[in-house]
């Protein structure tokens, strides 16, 4: 016979496992938060700025209620691999004023990836099923102008914070159901 | 300047339902929800709820879960509090707070809103 | 629920004195780099006013002499020297999950 068995391996609790990702959430809602404030400062917004290639925002007022944590975590994960992306391309072809945002786009890359990754980790956890892999995305078109490269910057910074607000809201209501 | 102005002081009978504004003015409403909180007599601050001006979606305390209700009108810069099935025990000042979830404190601080519930 | 508990009930002090009050919260509320505790003043007829947020950071406006310290459990706020103004209840506050919760407060007396 072979080896005998190892000790059955504990499935960690779910509660403090989504209590961390809420946490991670929150942690990186401030710094969009703190970066999207900057932007403001240097370059003011005139409007609200929209970016097609962004996802659109996951829930409405009423929905809440209505939520289950395999679609939070599966609409949250495949949204921020887009906020991700759009990050990426606006640190590379972002142009020279956004530079000036530089370390901090950065930093919200390296904590949006990690966000991601923890993500991941919680869905395996739970036994929640894996998304099929991404089909690749269409590369993104450049900025036409600098000013272009500042408005995708308001959009994109916009989108994430109300994108990771939504998501402390559901991940904070599905763990008091856990 | 920062403000946050509330409705005024209301008398309500038991199992009646109130509904309290917050007109928000010197700030871009949809950069901060806007939170609320209950004040007793003798009794520790309650938060109630938050909610997020530009997508909606209000989380609420479970204590207040289904008789507390949050709205806000965009293009007012207002939001709303509405309490049903009055009791004794909702007799309390409310405030409107701003707040937002990242780090989730009330910087800003309307005057409050006297609601007493008395047959 | 998280617990805030915070003592003494009421203090007794003369302007001029250092003030001490204490807040203890019934589990951790530090973590992922902050210490989710802030700290607001109260006086009669009036609504909270924000001193202290995520334990040590000072508000806008608020003066120098207000400072917050302490992290996992037990905080702290201190006033280095008394102002007549400063007479008034405090509240601690905690907001490291749903819902948030206050301490019953610390009624500070002049003496």
């Known amino acids: 016979p072979g080896p005998p068995p190892g000790p059955p391996r504990v499935s960690p609790d779910p509660r403090a496992e989504l209590d961390s990702t809420v946490l991670l959430t929150r942690s990186l809602l401030a710094d969009t938060r703190q970066l999207a404030a900057q932007l403001r400062d240097k370059f003011p917004a005139d409007g609200d700025h929209n970016l097609d290639s962004l996802p659109t925002l996951a829930m409405s007022a009423g929905a809440l209620g209505a939520l289950q944590l395999p679609g939070v975590l599966t609409r949250l994960r495949a949204d921020l691999l887009s906020y991700l992306r759009h990050v990426q391309w606006l640190r590379r072809a972002g142009g020279s004023s956004l530079k000036t945002l530089e370390p901090e786009l950065g930093t919200l890359q390296a904590r949006l990836d990690r966000l991601l990754r923890r993500l991941q980790l919680l869905m395996s956890r739970l036994a929640l099923p894996q998304p099929p892999p991404d089909p690749p995305a269409p590369p993104l078109a450049p900025p036409s102008s600098a000013w272009g490269g500042i408005r995708a910057a308001h959009a994109i910074l916009g989108g994430l914070h109300l994108t990771l607000d939504w998501a402390v809201r559901g991940l904070l209501l599905l763990k008091t159901r856990l | 300047e920062v403000q946050l102005v509330q409705s005024g002081a209301e008398v309500k009978k038991p199992g009646a339902s109130v509904k309290i504004s917050c007109k928000a003015s010197?700030?871009?409403?949809?950069?901060?929800?806007m939170d609320w909180v209950k004040q007793a007599p003798g009794q520790r601050l309650e938060w109630i709820g938050d909610?997020?001006?530009?997508?909606?979606?209000?989380i609420y305390n479970q204590k207040f879960t289904g008789r507390a209700t949050l709205t806000v009108d965009k293009s007012a810069s207002t939001a709303y509090m509405e309490l049903s099935s009055l009791r004794s025990e909702d007799t309390a000042v409310y405030y409107c707070?701003?707040?937002?979830?990242?780090?989730?404190?009330?910087?800003?601080w309307g005057q409050g809103t006297t609601v007493t519930v008395s047959s | 629920d998280i617990v805030l508990t915070q003592s003494p009930a009421s203090l007794a002090l003369s302007p001029g004195e250092r003030a001490t009050l204490s807040c203890r919260a019934s589990?951790?509320?530090?973590?992922?780099?902050?210490?989710?505790i802030h700290w607001y003043q109260q006086k009669p007829g009036q609504a909270p006013r924000l001193l202290i947020y995520?334990?040590?950071n000072l508000e806008s406006g608020v003066p120098a002499r207000f400072s917050g310290s302490g992290s996992g459990t037990d905080f702290t706020l201190t006033i280095s020297s008394l102002e007549e103004e400063d007479f008034a209840t405090y509240y601690c506050?905690?907001?490291?999950?749903?819902?948030?919760?206050f301490g019953q407060g610390t009624k500070l007396e002049i003496k």
């Open positions: 589990k951790s509320v530090s973590t992922e780099g902050y210490s989710y």
């Open positions: 506050q905690h907001s490291r999950d749903l819902p948030p919760t």
């Open positions: 010197g700030y871009t409403f949809t950069d901060y929800n």
């Open positions: 707070a701003r707040g937002e979830l990242a780090h989730w404190y009330f910087d800003v």
């Open positions: 909610i997020n001006p530009t997508i909606g979606a209000p």
């Open positions: 995520l334990a040590s």
